[in-house]
């Protein structure tokens, strides 16, 4: 019995077309992506083929102004429209808190919305009770399949679930669902879920009874042989993993932003078994025209976003400096403003032992893109911000060594002068450089703000404790020479969309004035 | 739990034809194949065919093509397989097997004598 | 017709010894191979498929291995019932294709 699942994940609000590196289309004719894109094929796919399942496997919340303005209404709205199967929670669900996951999701959605390991207790037990799922057992021609779901147990400092939902070990809590599941006589299961590529295999080789493991979080790509676009392969798709009890278990993950459809063909015998497993992420290119009538909806949506870029988000009663005369050379306001509202957006007092779980904000100064001005009335829009942040980049959460900043920091100002973007700008940090030293040799003073402590105050880094630091994916994934941050981070966990974080922060203060204050000397 | 039950034992004269049922259980049957397999007195496996049960699709090995006939009845989740004008070479026990032989049936000895 | 050589046809071996029979096909068969086990008046029962994948309830000391167009079954540590007749079955096109067989009998 031969099952064709068609699958996604970390689309991250891109209900649009896109260009090839995923930020807004410019040339229409090279864009890729986007739901209408996704629906034609998925259609071609269901037409051609009999038993066909179409699953995402979490975070389609936040990450471009579609989400800034509908939270959610948008995915809900889009996936019903494509008739999705099912839905793992990612952690970017939970970005507004429970209510805004339970009230435009959630409520909303006409397929399941699973996870196996939130448990939800208090007053929530009973308000969320049915509206997310362990488990569902679907119908699929003459058979029934098994889809279990599995959210990241790091959602807490990722995410707002708050204090009502308890994330378990995500193996721990899928074996006695996969378990029930064999009591029902059901042989053939998907793990679709959202903890990342090394979670994934762990489960497929962990979990009896789990017969493919569909994931994301990660944004890992698959290919076997020549990979269509830009993105290189972490490894064969399908991934095998061999199982502990001696099962070939196939592993996949579809990139992220909606620019690939998964597709894994899986055959199937009596017993359940894997058989065989082959496929490829098909590229949504242009050569896969739009669907007509969901690009007409899109574009009915659309009118509300153009309407919304223009609204006040909240006033500055000083000049926010982003140009690049300042912020390549020295700190300024623009750069304090950014990483305080990146700071601002990981608050999350999960442990009484510490005022939070991360202090500390790098941010290169070529990714400040316009300053703004503060004689407009004071006023900020979210079209102000997309010039001061044009690139569609998100602020991540990654762990590093003390050893691996300082090499961050000698790096920023290793040729000094020359207005290179990379140049660091920081929050929860003070750096000294003293510049008449050789490069590499430039930092003298590096202290960072403690997390493990009630009245925050300033250490000196320590080369072999591990940091959380909160930066642009743009360095997380090593630009502007920052190789050293991704060869060495120990864990990176991609965040909300930088102008989000930016404009949330501003329409919570409602005023601000950022000062240059001697964070970088 | 999948389960094939075969039909019991047939002793045939040369150039008759013998048909052997397998009844299937445990599984949804329409969704999956039915290979027939078989063995001769003390030699090794010889794949005769399979059937595809939701349509009645079949492929036959070179060998049987012509002789063989697999059909099947989806009220009853039975596969048959016929085999006609009989020789004492057919002299085996048949075997059903499930679509990736990962279950068989008991087996069906067929003799043929005069 | 995929041809599916088998080797050796019989071997003799002792408890604990490990056991090695190898498949080779005339044409790549991707990893479309099962290894049977058949013992004298039964029907044969499917150990391995789809070359290396354990069938549940067998013995972690079967493994199959192999790719293209050589592949093989290994016994880590033969029990007593393990002495049987081993069979490997191509399954990549029709028609499917058995090996010879190989007996193992104690030594």
């Known amino acids: 019995w031969e099952l064709t699942i068609l699958h996604t994940n970390d689309v991250h609000s891109r209900l649009e077309q896109t260009s090839e590196d995923s930020s807004k289309c410019v040339n229409a004719s090279r864009c890729m992506g986007g739901v209408a894109r996704l629906f034609t094929k998925v259609q071609q796919i269901r037409r051609a083929e009999p038993n066909v399942l179409l699953l995402d496997a979490g975070d389609q919340y936040q990450g471009t102004i579609w989400f800034t303005v509908y939270k959610g209404a948008e995915v809900a709205h889009f996936m019903n429209a494509l008739r999705y199967d099912a839905m793992a929670l990612g952690n970017h669900e939970f970005d507004n808190g429970v209510e805004g996951l339970i009230e435009p999701l959630l409520k909303e959605a006409k397929f399941p919305i699973l996870s196996a390991n939130i448990k939800a207790k208090g007053p929530l037990a009973s308000q969320i009770s049915g509206l997310y799922l362990p488990y569902k057992v679907l119908p699929v021609g003459d058979e029934v399949v098994g889809i279990v779901g599995y959210t990241s147990k790091e959602t807490p400092f990722l995410s707002n679930p708050g204090t009502n939902l308890v994330f378990e070990d995500e193996i721990t809590a899928l074996q006695p669902e996969v378990d029930k599941l064999k009591t029902l006589n059901v042989n053939k299961i998907i793990a679709l879920g959202h903890s990342g590529f090394e979670m994934d295999k762990l489960i497929a080789q962990k979990v009896r009874g789990v017969d493919v493991v569909v994931g994301g979080h990660s944004n890992t790509f698959l290919y076997t042989g020549n990979p269509p676009s830009k993105e290189v392969p972490a490894g064969k798709y399908p991934f095998i993993v061999t199982s502990d009890d001696g099962r070939k278990v196939p592993v996949v993950q579809a990139y992220a932003f909606g620019k690939y459809l998964g597709y894994l063909k899986i055959e199937f015998d009596e017993r359940g078994n894997v058989i065989s497993s082959h496929g490829n992420p098909i590229l949504l290119n242009s050569s896969i025209p739009e669907d007509p009538s969901i690009k007409a909806d899109i574009n009915k949506w659309r009118i509300k976003l153009d309407n919304y870029s223009t609204q006040e988000l909240g006033k500055t009663i000083v000049y926010l400096d982003g140009s690049s005369q300042s912020c390549r050379f020295r700190e300024c306001n623009m750069g304090n403003l950014i990483c305080d509202a990146m700071i601002n957006n990981n608050l999350r007092h999960t442990d009484e032992m510490f005022w939070n779980h991360v202090s500390m904000c790098i941010l290169n100064g070529g990714g400040i893109r316009s300053p703004i001005d503060e004689r407009n009335n004071g006023t900020i829009t979210w079209e102000n911000l997309a010039a001061v942040l044009p690139f569609g980049g998100t602020f991540d959460l990654v762990q590093l060594k003390g050893s691996t900043l300082k090499k961050a920091f000698e790096h920023s100002v290793h040729r000094y002068g020359q207005s290179t973007g990379e140049f660091l700008q920081v929050g929860g940090i003070h750096v000294v450089y003293d510049l008449s030293r050789k490069p590499g040799d430039r930092v003298v003073k590096l202290d960072v703000l403690c997390t493990k402590c009630r009245v925050p105050s300033y250490d000196p880094l320590k080369m072999d404790e591990v940091y959380k630091v909160i930066l642009p994916n743009f360095l997380a994934n090593g630009g502007d020479g920052f190789q050293m941050i991704k060869d060495e981070l120990l864990r990176h966990d991609s965040g909300d969309q930088d102008i989000n974080v930016v404009s949330t922060y501003i329409s919570k203060m409602k005023v601000i004035y950022p000062a240059v204050e001697g964070r970088i000397k | 739990e999948v389960q094939l039950v075969q039909s019991g034992a047939e002793v045939k004269k040369p150039g008759a034809s013998v048909k052997v049922s397998c009844k299937a259980s445990g599984y949804t049957f329409t969704a999956y194949f039915m290979n027939w397999v078989m063995q001769a007195p003390g030699q090794g496996l010889e794949w005769i065919g399979r059937?595809?049960?939701?349509?009645?699709?079949?492929f036959y090995s070179q060998k049987f093509k012509g002789r063989a006939t697999l059909t099947v009845d989806k009220s009853t989740s039975t596969v048959y397989m016929e085999l006609s004008s009989l020789r004492s070479e057919d002299t085996a026990v048949y075997y059903c097997?499930?679509?990736?032989?990962?279950?068989w049936g008991q087996g069906t000895t067929v003799t043929v004598s005069s | 017709d995929i041809q599916m050589t088998q080797s050796p046809s019989s071997l003799s071996a002792s408890v604990g010894d490990r056991v090695t029979i190898t498949c080779r096909a005339s044409?790549?068969?991707?990893?479309?191979l099962n290894w049977l086990q058949q013992k004298p008046g039964k029907a044969p029962k499917r150990l391995i498929y789809?070359?290396?994948s354990l069938d549940s309830g067998v013995p972690s000391r079967f493994s199959g291995s192999g790719s293209g167009t050589e592949y093989t079954l290994t016994i880590s540590s033969l029990q007593p019932e393990d002495f049987a007749t081993y069979y490997c079955?191509?399954?990549?096109?029709?028609?499917?294709?058995f090996g010879g067989g190989t007996k193992v009998e104690i030594k």
């Open positions: 097997a499930t679509s990736y032989v990962g279950d």
């Open positions: 044409q790549d068969i991707g990893d479309s």
């Open positions: 079955l191509q399954y990549a096109s029709f028609p499917w294709t």
């Open positions: 059937i595809y049960h939701n349509n009645g699709d079949t």
């Open positions: 789809a070359t290396s």
